[in-house]
């Protein structure tokens, strides 16, 4: 029955987010006659592709087709057959593929070519696979959350969509954390954006927005960990690395060749007298935090103020939605509540990191050890990035809202990407008055 045409006139769109650690497929749906209204597009399905990110298929491109099959078949089931041919499919690859392209355009092209051939075999309207820029990733994430929060709507609503939503038209900033990059995007308060590379101008629904955005390549949680390990092993006296970012009792062997595989560790590369080293966890939040801070160069700033590594950052303004790995990690650590202060978060992280690896494995028996082992690092990294990297304070911490979904749609760049490519965000306010959210929620 699922392939019967729906009585109402609806449209669908598919976006694949080819991230550094995994690929996710999102299916969106909207009423055809209300394409230009605000907030009408919503997510009906998310399918996480089993396996790593597409950049890991360099040596096995022939496996990409099988890798994508389950989620593409799921899309075939969810979307009525009568709609297949007119349903656009977009694949956007992010920082994992940016890093692969940095190493070799040929290898990145080869992966994307096979992805395109695989996706072209489905009955949908495939629109192409491409590596999106960090600026696009930041911008589309910002568009997504503000679209879902109703910030582009001219009507001030009498009710709130989500608990943390303020009932005004001030946009939310967007904080996105992936495996290989992190993005910060917001509208600064009447300050000129000193670096042209970080400035975006939008006209959406009749209103102009001057947006600041930056994508920090190599500062996603996975690449940040590789950077930290490469930095710390430089000063290790032997092939044992006593690491405060892992729980006491945790042990893992790392190949030096794996450590130097990524361009992110290039600045720390050196000839080591061993081919492998062993991480031995000592579980100390404060020391872990100090080690992470060494990844942020704050000694040089050619602007009035910077985040780190000489990158311009205007003073923070307004509320921020922190999503993707910001949310997943903090959710696991049970730290997403609006009521938890920054001091409390830090305290809980200290306690979490100090717990023995055996105790952690017992408490979270259902979680894969590879992921479980990295929550101490990831949580500490998030705090370091937000506080020292982006200059949030104990006071402004309350303006960070850890968001997984808004109105059932995942926060992330994919919805904004599709809205843009399908021309569903008009520059001017549509003549017909949009329905209030209450009509269709």
């Amino acid at each position: 029955t699922q392939n019967k045409a729906l009585p109402e006139n609806v449209k669908y769109g598919i976006v694949l987010d080819a991230g550094s650690s995994h690929t996710s497929l999102y299916i969106y749906k909207w009423p055809a006659e209300k394409e230009n209204d605000t907030g009408v597009v919503h997510q009906v399905e998310e399918c996480r592709v089993k396996g790593p990110g597409i950049s890991k298929f360099v040596q096995k491109v022939n496996e990409i087709g099988i890798y994508l099959t389950d989620c593409m078949e799921r899309a075939r089931e969810v979307i009525p057959r009568s709609q297949h041919q007119e349903t656009p499919v977009y694949l956007g690859a992010t920082a994992g593929m940016r890093l692969l392209r940095m190493e070799s355009e040929e290898l990145a092209d080869r992966v994307l070519d096979v992805v395109e051939r695989s996706l072209s075999n489905y009955p949908f309207d495939f629109q192409g696979a491409r590596i999106i820029t960090g600026q696009e990733e930041g911008a589309y994430g910002w568009i997504t959350i503000n679209y879902l929060l109703g910030k582009f709507s001219q009507k001030t609503r009498w009710f709130s969509i989500v608990p943390y939503e303020t009932n005004n038209q001030e946009t939310f900033g967007a904080l996105d954390l992936g495996g290989a990059s992190t993005q910060v995007t917001f509208v600064p308060q009447n300050q000129t954006i000193e670096s042209p590379d970080n400035a975006l101008q939008f006209r959406l629904y009749g209103k102009d927005y001057n947006v600041y955005t930056h994508s920090f390549l190599c500062y996603g949680k996975d690449q940040a960990l590789w950077q930290k390990l490469a930095k710390d092993i430089q000063v290790a006296s032997n092939e044992i690395l006593r690491d405060p970012c892992f729980h006491p009792g945790y042990k893992k062997v790392v190949n030096v060749s794996d450590l130097y595989k990524t361009p992110c560790t290039k600045r720390f590369e050196m000839t080591l007298p061993f081919q492998q080293f062993e991480i031995q966890g000592i579980g100390n939040y404060q020391q872990c935090h100090q080690s992470i801070l060494e990844l942020f160069n704050t000694s040089y700033c050619p602007y009035s103020q910077c985040a780190f590594n000489g990158i311009f950052l205007p003073p923070l303004q307004g509320d921020f939605g922190a999503f993707s790995a910001f949310y997943f990690v903090m959710k696991f650590l049970n730290l997403t509540s609006e009521k938890v202060s920054q001091e409390k978060v830090t305290e809980m992280m200290k306690n979490f990191c100090a717990k023995s690896w055996e105790a952690i494995k017992t408490s979270y028996a259902g979680v894969k050890e590879k992921y479980l082992s990295e929550y101490c690092f990831s949580g500490t990294y998030i705090l370091s990035l937000l506080l020292q990297g982006y200059h949030f304070t104990a006071d402004s911490w309350e303006h960070i809202h850890f968001i997984g979904k808004i109105q059932g749609s995942d926060a992330g760049w994919t919805l904004g990407y599709m809205l843009n490519l399908t021309n569903m965000i008009p520059a001017e306010q549509p003549l017909s008055t949009p329905l209030s959210h209450s009509t269709y929620v």
Epitope: V58, Q59, V61, R98, R101, M102, E103, S104, E105, E106, L107, A108, D109, R110, T133, G134, Q135, D197, L217, C218, P263, C264, T265, K266, R267, F268, E269
Partner: antibody, heavy 116, light 111 residues
Framework: EVQLQQSGPELVKPGASVKMSCKAS????????MHWVKQSHGRTLEWIGY????????TFNQKFKGRATLTVNTSSRTAYMELRSLTSEDSAAYYC?????????WGQGTLVTVSA | DIVLTQSPASLAVSLGQRATISCRAS??????????MYWFQQKPGQPPNLLIY???NQGSGVPARFRGSGSGTDFSLNIHPMEADDTAMYFC?????????FGGGTKLEIK
Amino acid sequence: EVQLQQSGPELVKPGASVKMSCKASGYTFTDYNMHWVKQSHGRTLEWIGYIVPLNGGSTFNQKFKGRATLTVNTSSRTAYMELRSLTSEDSAAYYCARGGTRFAYWGQGTLVTVSA
Amino acid sequence: DIVLTQSPASLAVSLGQRATISCRASESVDNFGVSFMYWFQQKPGQPPNLLIYGASNQGSGVPARFRGSGSGTDFSLNIHPMEADDTAMYFCQQTKEVPYTFGGGTKLEIK
């Protein structure tokens, strides 16, 4: 449109150093490596090395290691190469080229003449 | 280091005819199913211009008369039909492994 604009010609004395620049525009500077290539006598092309603008890490052709230094200024989107202890053998055109493994965009070159 | 031997060192071809330049590598330049072989054209006073990447793919804006072929250690660049504007130096390059290396060059002229 991607462009690489290199600094002007240099006349330097033997034993001295030279520092040339390569200003990039039209793309995200930190998304691609910057390579440097030497061309002598209008014929022989030699790869010197590359820098990762993202973090300043570099890799060299052993022949130039220790004598060439590659740096970047990300805010001005500029890559630099300094060559030290110059001899007449270093008289050549030096090019910067953007790429991972594909040198699709090249600067116009900086001509270095080493002469007493 | 991978040595690239280009031949011939110079070549004169009549307009409309075929020019073939070959490049032999001292070891395979293939990896992960890709040939890391490139062909450049260089005219006097100009930087090299990418013609062919990945052994057989045409660079942006490169006319169809430039064709690259080969894999492993043996590669060739074919220009057909030869035009007056094709008078230039031609270089092959490998980027399979550091140090990246270039062939010695082929000077192509009109006969």
